[in-house]
Interface confidence: low
């Protein structure tokens, strides 16, 4: 069936439309286009004869139409009048006619709309505002946007006049937003510039900050007032009802008790004509003197001297408080407070008592703190430590030893090598060492205030080849299921790998085995008798690898539940009873026997010759391990038949 399709159906003025023909019959003579829904010679636009390929304009031809060989018709530069129906008349070669009708609609391109308002400065909770979208256009749809969102649902928002007018009833400050309108028709959509609604409101009840109402004499009073308001509020300050100034902030330096009173902030909005006030009551307290600490001993000696700290000045009916290290006083027998808490005494000071110490005086408003006081406790020197802890060094490296001893005042240091004084410094540095630098290195620390000296000696060996290592142990006889043992591979050397073997095998994976200290220390937790093995450590560096002699762990265990043998419990009268008791234990346990609860002998074997029914009863073997402190026993019933 012959059909006409309009592309597009809705056409904008000035654009073009194509009337596209579908299912055009075969064997045509020609065809004509007419304006309207029927064939009318007066309304012919154009005719076309296929044989001659000749197009002939008709009375309705405007010069804007182009006919194509496939019978489609293009109309350019569309005007409003072009809206409507178009009929195609097809004449076939057999002179049989066929007709088809198509249509399109013409719409104008919309102009950019604008918003008019009936009230440019509405007052909150009082006025309404009507926005109207201009111009009024036929066949146009009107839409509204608030802050680029579609209109919210609200009983205070109402659309009218075909949605061209948006009315906001009883405006609030929250209606201060960006409003836009949009016009749409089938061929165009245009959005207006935004209009910002300026809602007049306030002032709200002002807030005065800061909130605190208590001040000390000598401080500055700086009050700030703020009230939500549009346009911004004008502020006035009143003290005890008397006008002070028209500013948002009130500043009074170096206040006294006389500045106590009621402070009123008044906020005024000139556009709404409204006033709001807020009152705060300020109290100014007299300033007490700042406390300070005095001491009866400025340089106490550790473990010798006591120190009494006193909080000054002395004021009647005052509470004194103390702090050490910014904490309240710890409970300690070495800390004593006087009855009025004004004096704090430290008995037998230690280096940890340095402080800082603060005292405080409490008044109605706050606590006044003294400046902190630090005690200069004289101590030391302790035994010096030489670092690093390595004892073996490779030739060619630099030897840098540092000595430190805890001391106040700081210790003075001296270094000796093989008993010969070298230098009076904390650090000893020897570059590019050789085997000849091996020897005894002594650090001496001296405290000039106490006159005390302490020394530490370290043996240093310079060698490319590591020595054969050895194993040291922190527990030579650990108890099973109780003790831990830490094996350490000696010596400690720079850039060295430490390895361990147990019974010639690498370490088994076990939660009870832990390597630490760069694998130099092997710790066995909760030892068991199965840990009584041969332990070997190995050391490696870039030039050598050596293993220690094995160390066998001697685990103390037991005694386990003893076993009495032979297992027989029935004997014939006249036989010899020979009971042997055995309990797994390290060291071997002490054995004792009881027959029917009566102690017998302290031997492993109990022998009774020629037993009789009188020997019936309970035979108990008791075992005791003095090293583990543990005991065990077992009871066996013996029956002798006549």
């Amino acid at each position: 069936k012959l059909t006409i399709e309009s592309t597009p159906f809705n056409v904008a003025e000035g654009k073009e439309v194509l009337l596209l023909v579908h299912n055009l019959p075969q064997h045509l003579f020609g065809y004509s286009w007419y304006k309207g829904e029927r064939v009318d010679g007066n309304r012919q636009i154009i005719g076309y004869v296929i044989g001659t390929q000749q197009a002939t304009p008709g009375p309705a031809y405007s010069g804007r139409e182009i006919i194509y060989p496939n019978a489609s018709l293009l109309i350019q530069n569309i005007i409003q009048n072009d809206t409507g129906f178009y009929t195609l008349h097809v004449i076939k070669s057999d002179l049989v006619n066929e007709e088809a009708t198509g249509q399109f609609r013409v719409y104008p391109e919309l102009p950019k709309p604008s918003i008019s308002s009936n009230n440019s400065k509405p007052v909150e909770d009082k006025d309404a505002v009507a926005f109207t979208c201009e111009p009024e256009t036929q066949d146009a749809t009107y839409l509204w946007w608030v802050n680029n969102q579609s209109l919210p649902v609200s009983p205070r928002l109402q659309l009218s006049n075909g949605n061209r007018t948006l009315t906001l009833f009883n405006v609030t400050r929250n209606d201060t937003a960006s409003y836009k309108c949009e016009t749409q028709n089938p061929v165009s959509a245009r959005r207006s510039d935004s209009v910002i609604l300026n809602v007049l409101y306030g002032p709200d009840a002002p807030t005065i900050s800061p909130l605190n109402t208590s001040y000390r004499s000598g401080e500055n009073l700086n009050l700030s007032c703020h009230a939500a308001s549009n346009p911004p509020a004008q502020y006035s300050w009143f003290v005890n009802g008397t006008f002070q100034q028209s500013t948002q902030e009130l500043f009074i330096p170096n206040i006294t008790v006389n500045n106590s009173g009621s402070y009123t902030c008044q906020a005024h909005n000139s556009d709404t004509g409204l006033n709001r006030t807020t009152v705060t009551t300020i109290t100014v307290y007299a300033e007490p003197p700042k406390p300070f600490i005095t001491s009866n001993n400025s340089n106490p000696v550790e473990d010798e001297d006591a120190v009494a700290l006193t909080c000054e000045p002395e004021i009647q009916n005052t509470t004194y408080l103390w702090w050490v290290n910014n904490q309240s006083l710890p409970v300690s027998p070495r800390l004593q407070l006087s009855n009025d808490n004004r004096t704090l005494t430290l008995l037998s000071v230690t280096r940890n008592d340095v402080g800082p110490y603060e005292c405080g005086i409490q008044n109605e408003l706050s606590v006044d703190h003294s400046d902190p006081v630090i005690l200069n406790v004289l101590y030391g020197p302790d035994d010096p430590t030489i670092s690093p802890s390595y004892t073996y060094y490779r030739p060619g490296v630099n030897l840098s030893l540092s000595c430190h001893a805890a001391s106040n005042p700081p210790a003075q240091y001296s270094w000796l090598i093989d008993g010969n004084i070298q230098q009076h410094t904390q650090e000893l540095f020897i570059s590019n060492i050789t085997e000849k630098n091996s020897g005894l290195y002594t650090c001496q620390a001296n405290n000039s205030a106490s006159g005390h000296s302490r020394t530490t000696v370290k043996t240093i060996t310079v060698s490319a080849e590591l020595p054969k290592p050895s194993i040291s142990s922190n527990n030579s006889k650990p108890v099973e299921d109780k003790d831990a043992v830490a094996f350490t591979c000696e010596p400690e050397a720079q850039n060295t790998t430490y390895l361990w073997w147990v019974n010639g095998q690498s370490l088994p994976v076990s939660p009870r085995l832990q390597l630490s200290n760069g694998n130099r220390t092997l710790t066995l937790f909760n030892v068991t008798r199965n840990d009584a093995r041969a332990y070997v450590c190995g050391i490696q560096n870039s030039v050598s690898a050596n293993r220690s002699d094995p160390v066998t762990l001697d685990v103390l265990y037991g005694p386990d539940t003893p076993i009495i043998s032979p297992p027989d419990s029935s004997y014939l009268s006249g036989a010899n009873l020979n009971l042997s008791c055995h309990s797994a234990s390290n060291p071997s346990p002490q054995y004792s026997w009881r027959i029917n609860g009566i102690p017998q002998q302290h031997t492993q074997v109990l022998f009774i010759a020629k037993i009789t029914p009188n020997n019936n009863g309970t035979y108990a073997c008791f075992v005791s391990n003095l090293a583990t402190g543990r005991n065990n026993s077992i009871v066996k019933s013996i029956t002798v038949s006549a």
């Epitope: 790998t497 870039s542 030039v543």
Partner: antibody, heavy 120, light 106 residues
Framework: QVKLQQSGAELVKSGGSVKLSCTAS????????MHWLRQGPEQGLEWIGW????????EYAPKFQGKATFTTDTSSNTAYLQLSSLTSEDTAVYYC?????????????WGQGTTVTVSS | ENVLTQSPAIMSASPGEKVTITCSAS?????MHWFQQKPGTSPKLVIY???NLASGVPARFSGSGSGTSYSLTISRMEAEDAATYYC?????????FGAGTKLELK
């Protein structure tokens, strides 16, 4: 007994990357160092570096810094070598080796090698 | 890095003949290791820490040297000894190898 099984030969385009694997049996790689080396066609041996599978510590030869990345998966006892930005000069047989910690650090056990060919 | 120079690069020896391969280091090393590689196979350790024979290596192989000069000796060449031999140092990083000595059977 100890065995190091390496992944199969790889043909890679220039600029690409490849990840080689080395699966150990007969020992736990956490107890050892895993070294990687390579040997170009008709060339000598080059040491790429090592990884300590126990803690992930690595040491790379300066030449292979940024080119090679070592990783391990101790659960599968496998070491990996990732090579990136490959060029024709990276065409070589890549070996993994176990550096035993029971003596000095020498190479005891070698994988069979993985041939990597970089084509342009 | 420590450069190891091997000599000769190629040599041939008759069965029963004594073979010596030398390795010179650009910096002093504590020990030298020696590897043997046959075509299509992975290298195999023959001597470690200058003079120690690796497991399964025949006693005709020996090593010596100190400082910067080291050598590998085969007391009596056998057919199965034909291979390329590499020296290797592990005193400093990066670990380095010599360029190799190809030993052929005459």
């Amino acid at each position: 007994q100890v065995k190091l099984q390496q992944s199969g030969a790889e043909l890679v385009k220039s600029g690409g990357s490849v990840k080689l694997s080395c699966t150990a049996s007969g020992f736990n790689i956490k107890d050892s160092y895993m070294h990687w080396l390579r040997q170009g066609p008709e060339q000598g041996l080059e040491w790429i570096g090592w990884i300590d599978p126990e803690n992930g510590d690595t040491e790379y030869a300066p030449k292979f810094q940024g080119k090679a990345t070592f990783t391990t998966d101790t659960s599968s006892n496998t070491a990996y070598l990732q090579l990136s930005s490959l060029t024709s000069e990276d065409t070589a047989v890549y070996y993994c080796n176990e550096g035993t910690p029971t003596g000095p650090y020498y190479f005891d056990y070698w994988g069979q090698g993985t041939t990597v060919t970089v084509s342009s | 890095e420590n450069v190891l120079t091997q000599s000769p690069a190629i040599m041939s020896a008759s069965p029963g003949e004594k073979v010596t391969i030398t390795c010179s280091a650009s910096s002093s090393v504590s020990y030298m290791h020696w590897f043997q590689q046959k075509p299509g196979t992975s290298p195999k350790l023959v001597i470690y820490s200058t003079s120690n024979l690796a497991s399964g290596v025949p006693a005709r192989f020996s090593g010596s040297g100190s400082g910067t000069s080291y050598s590998l000796t085969i007391s009596r060449m056998e057919a199965e000894d034909a291979a390329t031999y590499y020296c290797q140092q592990r005193s400093s990083y990066p670990l380095t190898f010599g360029a190799g000595t190809k030993l052929e059977l005459k």
